[in-house]
Amino acid sequence: APSCPQNVNISGGTFTLSHGWAPGSLLTYSCPQGLYPSPASRLCKSSGQWQTPGATRSLSKAVCKPVRCPAPVSFENGIYTPRLGSYPVGGNVSFECEDGFILRGSPVRQCRPNGMWDGETAVCDNGAGHCPNPGISLGAVRTGFRFGHGDKVRYRCSSNLVLTGSSERECQGNGVWSGTEPICRQPYSYDFPEDVAPALGTSFSHMLGATNPTQKTKESLGRKIQIQRSGHLNLYLLLDCSQSVSENDFLIFKESASLMVDRIFSFEINVSVAIITFASEPKVLMSVLNDNSRDMTEVISSLENANYKDHENGTGTNTYAALNSVYLMMNNQMRLLGMETMAWQEIRHAIILLTDGKSNMGGSPKTAVDHIREILNINQKRNDYLDIYAIGVGKLDVDWRELNELGSKKDGERHAFILQDTKALHQVFEHMLDVSKLTDTICGVGNMSANASDQERTPWHVTIKPKSQETCRGALISDQWVLTAAHCFRDGNDHSLWRVNVGDPKSQWGKEFLIEKAVISPGFDVFAKKNQGILEFYGDDIALLKLAQKVKMSTHARPICLPCTMEANLALRRPQGSTCRDHENELLNKQSVPAHFVALNGSKLNINLKMGVEWTSCAEVVSQEKTMFPNLTDVREVVTDQFLCSGTQEDESPCKGESGGAVFLERRFRFFQVGLVSWGLYNPCLGSADKNSRKRAPRSKVPPPRDFHINLFRMQPWLRQHLGDVLNFLPL
């Protein structure tokens, strides 16, 4: 077969080919930020000629054109400046209201490099209607000027702009407009990952965190899909595998879906996951009817087995058939469970469609969506039982209208998105399921996104101050208790001057709490073995502080999971009859277990906890410490089995002021405290300029660095004695 010519450069931009120069290959242009390619893509035809999708005239030279944002068509009850036909990237538009009207939304908006305005639609409202004035987004025209109960407004976009959101909205009895705000956008515009992740997350995060079965959630964040304790979520992942998706992009689709699956199983809900790949025909890799759909490892392995070559004989995009296979799955499940049963009616359904183009065969996908809505009996009362997310990737041949038609329309939410590329998709799935904003005490959740602050990443981390100076660190283990080291308290029992500094979203300095009571392990006595030539002994180096008030849970303050508790068991997704021993076997399951602690400056540092034989060789080094232990005969006199050991190879060593802080691991996107920093043979902060400077020990140092952490699995009786009514402990 002939290949297509190679004279396809774009001035100022670059291009990629999905299958080289061979027929069927899709050439995709890209431009620097703030510019967009025209045309966006070309397809190599079997005749050996390039064809531009949707183009009527002959091949024109590809160019990068400047992105522009749409201008307001009309702005009611106010004025806007400057008045331009469209606005360049970085350009501003300002809004002011006439007397008697109050401005809602953003008074100034800026055109962003993706052709989208920042901020929110500006509306001049006098509060007269049953519903608030729904406004007119930039580039839109609205018909309908009455905002009473039952009144409707309709929207369309000017010139060649594309409408996303609801073209028609109705003022409902609760004073809220139905559907979602319409936005008019340039056909070439796309969404930034940092906008999509929270928008997607709003719909998802509470759905996942709300079923924390150990306590009822008091507050819900926006509209989140509520899954009651008995509830169940069916998640359907639909992955486009058509010809225009390159093999590499398909891998990223798979990886993103895996991320999603991994995250979703880390929450305390009952979930079944279906995996469907599609091109001309759909292929069901995992059905919700299969028991394995509830098992994360099975779902992930079926995803990993998804093969790009599965669809090489039919390379069209049949979105209808993919959605129809979801419908058929639902139909079968309804038959199995019984249409009238609670078991069927209480299942929530979320469909995520990942595609790179418009459907080009099999009929309108909207028909399949209508069937799905019908079988699930989606009406105003049952609107929360279905969410369809339509995510277009690649912004080249993606059809905004179609995506918008497929995505759910819910007030204050968006369900249709177009991302620039698969990398952006990966970023979104990495950050969308962030339950760190939940207000209940769900444990071990840290914000893992790249732009999160240190405190948001480790929201359990607290600082302990005897007076003005910081002394030790600790970890929130509930909304009122902090776990720390006993050796921090060497001034007797007067803790009236002590303060605990807890993260607070309103202040970068955190919030100070007084201590109601300090429970210091009675077994701790640093001088206990002085007569044996052990000048400092740190056995039982553990303490609990009860704060004078409860901490309000937030992105910056949240407890870490303590192993051997029901809370940790849920986070680990372990079966109900699990024991403390099971947790130890799962968390400390290797000779060298990667773990972390938090540095003085708040950053997360890495260590490796040595277990088994490696623990012995890790601890042996203590015999070389002649100052503290001048005539030590048995290392185990100093390093008892209460201690975890780290500090070998590339490990960071904690500083003295990091004592009491959590030693923690990450499992299934949740964090578990297995130890607390106690003592060590090397202090990397000693005499440093500030909290940001640490010195690595020279390789020749004798003894080499070693660090010892109280092992919480060895402190169970004491923890249970004092926290029995705070946490739900599992049998030993």
Epitope: Q469, T471, E536, L600, C655, K656, G657, A689, D690
Partner: nanobody
Framework: QVQLVESGGGLVQAGGSLRLSCSAS????????MGWFRQAPGKEREFVAS????????EYADSVKGRFTISRDNSKNTLYLQMNSLRAEDTAVYYC???????????????WGQGTLVTVSS
């Protein structure tokens, strides 16, 4: 906070010895890590030695290891620095410092003495 007063500085020949003392007022001396720092003319203040609140562990800067010894007497609320084999480069003002955490971060220390000058002539 602990009030600190250094003494014992002076002029000494290279190879000679000096013993610096630091007396602390305040009943909490025994619960503080104590340390010595020094500052040579035109240079940054640098860490010399520290001792834990228990007296059980000590740390030294590489430049003084084997020559200087830090010790404390909690019953007298006093910290000592025994300096042997002194060199011209040991010339500096020596400061005593108290730190509850034991890290002796220069940015965080709020208990310093006024310093005592040690001059080593060659």
């Amino acid at each position: 906070q602990v009030q600190l007063v250094e003494s014992g500085g002076g002029l000494v020949q290279a190879g000679g010895s000096l013993r610096l003392s630091c007396s602390a007022s305040g009943h909490t001396f025994r619960s503080y890590y104590m340390g010595w720092f020094r500052q040579a003319p035109g240079k940054e203040r640098e860490f010399v030695a520290s001792i834990s609140w228990t007296g059980g562990s000590t740390e030294y800067a590489d430049s003084v290891k084997g020559r200087f010894t830090i010790s404390r007497d909690n019953s007298k609320n006093t910290l000592y620095l025994q300096m042997n084999s002194l060199r011209a480069e040991d010339t500096a003002v020596y400061y005593c410092a108290a730190d509850y955490s034991g890290d002796f971060l220069l940015s965080d220390l709020d208990s310093w003495g006024q310093g005592t000058l040690v001059t080593v002539s060659s």
